[in-house]
């Protein structure tokens, strides 16, 4: 005759408030004759959770039909879980006896704990923009989870980061916990289109982690490079000078032309283009009138980018005799 085993496969069962918990219990033998009862806790003060034959247990239902002959599944479902339901649940076999039934064997127990999902991670970047080669900090926060064990990872464009510090609070027992992590990220010039991702894995998420993202475009400032060039061809009595502002981000930019130190108010032609890496190029054309009296014209292209100190590039205009005499309307 096979010895009776009480099998409770789950050591830990995480449940959410308001949901239904299923507690599994199977037996390996029909003998000895007697009922299987469910208790929470051990000892004389243990709480009766379910007795098929008597008592009132409106929140409990059986998974299978206990009245069927040869039934060996004594699993139960408990509805509308509340924090008061946490504890260790035991299915216990009794042997019929007189005057009382006698406890014969208990299952190893299943601990029911309240599981709460973490909130969607929120990633916050630095308050001010920083230039490439510098380090910026990003914080990630998620709240309201239980149990305390949680895993947090950082990624930049899919590559895992290692320079971060994480804290889970509180350190002691609590109904729910919070996680806060700070990652240090070195900015690259091409990071305008980059993302940092904070990924949170928790037992309640069943292998489907939560992610929070931040765009490095919010944190980076790529300062422009300036180049001022004079077009070789003259248009009538005008020379075309070009100021090329390259590889800057964000788009916020003010450009002014100065002629021999005097700011020019007149309209200039310009174009803005976006590069593949998300930075911008700005090209501005300035037409300078040429006269015999103006041999030493110095042009300055001044750029103020994203509220930073202005940078400028100068060009001393070269007006050859040949250029002065030329009168054809050639296009630059």
């Amino acid at each position: 005759e096979e010895e009776l085993q009480m099998i409770q496969p789950e050591k830990l069962l995480l449940v959410t408030v308001g949901k239904t918990a299923t507690l599994h219990c199977t037996v390996t033998s029909l003998l000895p004759v007697g009922p299987v009862l469910w208790f929470r806790g051990v000892g004389p003060g243990r709480e009766l959770i379910y007795n098929q034959k008597e008592g009132h247990f409106p929140r409990v239902t059986t998974v299978s039909d206990l009245t069927k002959r040869n039934n060996m599944d004594f699993s139960i479902r408990i509805s509308s879980i509340t924090p008061a339901d946490v504890g260790t649940y035991y299915c216990v076999k009794f042997r019929k006896g007189s005057p009382e039934n006698v406890e014969f064997k208990s299952g190893p127990g299943t601990e029911m704990a309240l599981g709460a999902k973490p909130s969607a991670p929120v990633v916050l970047g630095p308050a001010a923009r920083t230039t490439p080669e510098h380090t910026v900090s990003f914080t990630c926060e998620s709240h309201g989870f239980s149990p305390r064990d949680i895993t947090l990872k950082w990624f930049k464009n899919g590559n895992e980061l290692s320079d971060f510090q994480t804290n889970v609070d509180p350190t002691g027992q609590s109904v729910a916990y919070s996680i806060r992590s700070t990652a240090r990220v070195v900015l690259d010039p091409w990071d305008v289109r980059s993302q940092v991702i904070c990924e949170v894995a928790h037992v309640t998420l069943q292998g489907d982690p939560l992610r929070g993202t931040a765009n490095l475009s919010e944190a980076i400032r790529v300062p422009p490079t300036l180049e001022v060039t004079q077009q070789p061809m003259r248009v009538g009595n005008q020379v075309n000078v070009t100021c090329q502002v390259r590889k800057f981000y964000p788009q916020s930019l003010q450009l002014t032309w100065s002629e021999n130190g005097n700011v020019c108010q007149r309209e200039t032609a310009s174009t803005l283009t976006e590069n593949k890496d998300g930075t911008y190029n700005w090209t501005s054309w300035f037409l300078v009138n040429i006269s015999d009296q103006r041999d030493d014209v110095v042009l300055t292209c001044q750029v103020k980018h994203d509220g930073q100190l202005a940078v400028s590039k100068r060009l001393a205009l070269e007006v050859t005799v040949h250029q002065k005499d030329q009168s054809s309307d050639a296009t630059p």
Epitope: R46, E47, L48, Q52, K53, G55, H56, T67, K96, E100
Partner: antibody, heavy 113, light 108 residues
Framework: EVQLVQSGAEVKKPGATVKISCKAS????????MHWVQQAPGKGLEWIGR????????KYAPKFQGRVTITADTSTNTAYMELSSLRSEDTAVYYC??????WGQGTLVTVSS | EIVLTQSPATLSLSPGERATLSCSAS???????LYWYQQKPGQAPKLWIY???NLASGIPARFSGSGSGTDYTLTISSLEPEDFAVYYC?????????FGQGTKLEIK
């Protein structure tokens, strides 16, 4: 819907035997213990005993042991309580109940010479 | 056997008042096995509170139950006219199962 319908009132002479029935509907009596409770006029409730209709196992209160027999017929979904050697103090309303939660309407047994 | 003693035997109160009914056991009863029933004249008892503190279906929230070991209490926070009845505590922790003698809650 769970319902327990008991047999009608009985008048018995001292020394006689009475058998009360409790017909269940809305559930199978095999799945529950069926209890019997006595309530003498103006008095409180007293547990008489119970049966497990699945295997006919019974438990009785010492006060009624030897005079009471609880039986069940699973084919008709009915529980019975038989009390013998009746005396005047057995005059009471007798209730059947399913697993302590659902009660029958009661059966008045009057023992009088 | 476990003897359950209810006190007081009769409690005379007015609607709106708070009622406290006690049930004392001669030996310890697990709270899972302590039930309360309400009975009105000419009616069968009705399960009122199960496992010491859980209200049966449809029982108003003004009722509450508490206790452990040998001392149990049924409390009605503010009496309504329909609450006047007899209340019995009941243990089914060990055979023979027993009831208290009842507390009659009557209108003052």
């Amino acid at each position: 819907e769970v319902q327990l319908v008991q047999s009608g009132a009985e008048v018995k002479k001292p020394g006689a035997t009475v058998k009360i029935s409790c017909k269940a509907s809305g559930f199978n009596i095999k799945d529950y213990y069926m209890h019997w409770v006595q309530q003498a006029p103006g008095k409180g409730l007293e547990w008489i005993g119970r049966i497990d209709p699945e295997d006919a196992e019974t438990k009785y209160a010492p006060k009624f042991q030897g005079r009471v027999t609880i039986t069940a017929d699973t084919s008709t979904n009915t529980a019975y309580m038989e009390l013998s050697s009746l005396r005047s103090e057995d005059t009471a309303v007798y209730y059947c109940d399913r697993g302590l939660a659902y009660w029958g309407q009661g059966t008045l047994v009057t023992v009088s010479s | 056997e476990i003897v359950l003693t209810q006190s007081p035997a009769t409690l005379s109160l007015s609607p709106g008042e708070r009622a406290t009914l006690s049930c004392s056991a001669s030996s310890s009863v697990s709270s899972s096995y302590l039930y309360w029933y309400q009975q009105k004249p000419g009616q069968a008892p009705k399960l009122w509170i199960y496992s010491t503190s859980n209200l049966a279906s449809g029982i108003p929230a003004r009722f509450s139950g508490s206790g452990s070991g040998t001392d149990y209490t049924l409390t009605i926070s503010s009496l309504e006219p329909e609450d006047f009845a007899v209340y019995y505590c009941h243990q089914w922790s060990s055979y023979p199962y027993t009831f208290g003698q009842g507390t009659k809650l009557e209108i003052k």
